[in-house]
């Protein structure tokens, strides 16, 4: 690595970046026949075009404008599943219930999940050797303010009942500090939304606490009231029967505990 | 699995009220949002109310927006169907439906799980 070239404390861009995005894109507007007007190649272009030759450390929500409007999209408003610290189990959900969405079911969502990117300030070169890091480093980073910004539009979109899984084996199973908590909980639109649902997915396979009383869950409950929304929450206490309920709904086993 | 029975039914005149319930025998309701439709003579089944698992959300069909109110008890594991100033094209065979809580509230008969046998309801002019 040339010693001008800067170092950060987070991981490089992914490797094959710009491949994988095409790919993505391509395989996308395949499967969503909504979808399928969209020019993959312009949809990179713009990609890359919101964080090439631009400091790592300066992006803001404007550079990814004209993704954004290439990236439109509209998923049914009251179908919306947000989570936070437990996308797998978010993921495996919305691919048994398709009729519900999570950012990641979205094609700008789909694009770049568990991908990391960054360029270097007056070069053209995307850095594969390493990217900022959101706390060692700063927030304002290619991959951070993409996620805000379409965490933001998200949420902003979301109308009716708004779901939400928690993960229940955190020590703050609300974190004011996830996307979640700091950028969807307040980008949620009271004359729209009527009413965050909490979902928490409980991890030991004995715990039977009622964790919708945990003091995280009631600063969520407060800071959602607050917002004139209502709240409600549900205890998951065996996802395992959960996804199989989903399935399967008139299996007996479901009207009990799940 | 759940059994769903309503009761309630019967003939009222125009203007008049009902309430019907739906009660589940031995399972909970908890985990799931319940529906009313109804079904009039030689026509489509048709959605009119539903609430979801918690009760704190309703939905209804624009016809009875302001008549009817749908709520539960899910200590008493029964649904109910206030009908207030009916009419006589509210005439048909009323029933209640469960629907797993994991999705949104459905106003599509296909996303219930369980159904109750059904209660008349007859409105006379």
């Known amino acids: 690595v040339p010693r001008w070239r800067q170092q950060w404390s987070g991981p490089g861009t992914t490797k094959r970046f710009p491949e994988t995005v095409l790919a993505r894109c391509v395989k996308y507007t395949e499967i969503h026949p909504e979808m399928r007007h969209v020019d993959c190649q312009s949809v990179w272009d713009a990609f890359k075009g919101a964080f090439i030759s631009k400091h790592p450390c300066n992006i803001t929500e404007e550079d990814y404008q004209p993704l954004m409007k290439l990236g439109t999209q509209t998923v049914p408003c009251n179908k919306i599943l947000l989570w936070s610290r437990i996308k797998d189990l978010a993921h495996q959900f919305t691919q048994v219930q398709r009729d519900m969405f999570t950012l990641e079911d979205t094609l700008l969502g789909y694009l770049a999940d568990d991908l990391t990117w960054c360029g270097e300030f007056n070069t053209s070169k995307i850095n594969y050797q390493s990217c900022p890091d959101w706390r060692k480093d700063c927030s304002n980073n290619p991959v951070s303010v993409f996620w805000k910004t379409v965490s933001r539009r998200f949420a902003e979109a979301a109308c009716d009942v708004v779901h939400v899984m928690l993960n229940g084996s955190r020590s703050k199973i609300f974190d004011k500090n996830s996307t979640f908590g700091s950028v969807e909980v307040h980008n949620l639109q009271p004359e729209k939304v009527q009413t965050l649902e909490a979902w928490v997915i409980h991890g030991g396979r004995e715990d039977s606490r009622d964790l919708c009383q945990d003091p995280t869950i009631k600063e969520l409950e407060s800071i959602i009231s607050k917002r004139n929304i209502q709240f409600s929450c549900k205890n998951i206490y065996r996802p395992d029967k959960f996804l199989q309920c989903v399935k399967n709904p008139e299996d007996s086993s479901c009207t009990s505990e799940i | 699995e759940v059994q769903l029975e309503e009761s309630g039914g019967g003939l009222v005149q125009a203007g008049g009220s009902l309430r019907l319930s739906c009660a589940a025998s031995g399972r909970t309701l908890s985990n799931y949002h319940m529906g009313w439709f109804r079904q009039a003579p030689g026509k489509e089944r048709e959605f009119v109310a539903a609430?979801?698992?918690?009760?704190?959300?309703?939905y209804y069909m624009d016809s009875v927006k302001g008549r009817f109110t749908v709520s539960r008890d899910n200590a008493k594991n029964t649904v109910y169907l206030q009908m207030n100033s009916l009419k006589p094209e509210d005439t048909a065979v009323y029933y209640c439906?469960?629907?797993?809580?994991?999705?949104?509230?459905?106003?599509?008969?296909?996303?219930?799980?369980?159904w109750g046998q059904g209660t008349q309801v007859t409105v006379s002019s």
């Open positions: 439906a469960a629907q797993f809580f994991a999705a949104a509230v459905g106003r599509d008969s296909a996303k219930y799980a369980y």
């Open positions: 609430i979801n698992w918690s009760g704190l959300n309703t």
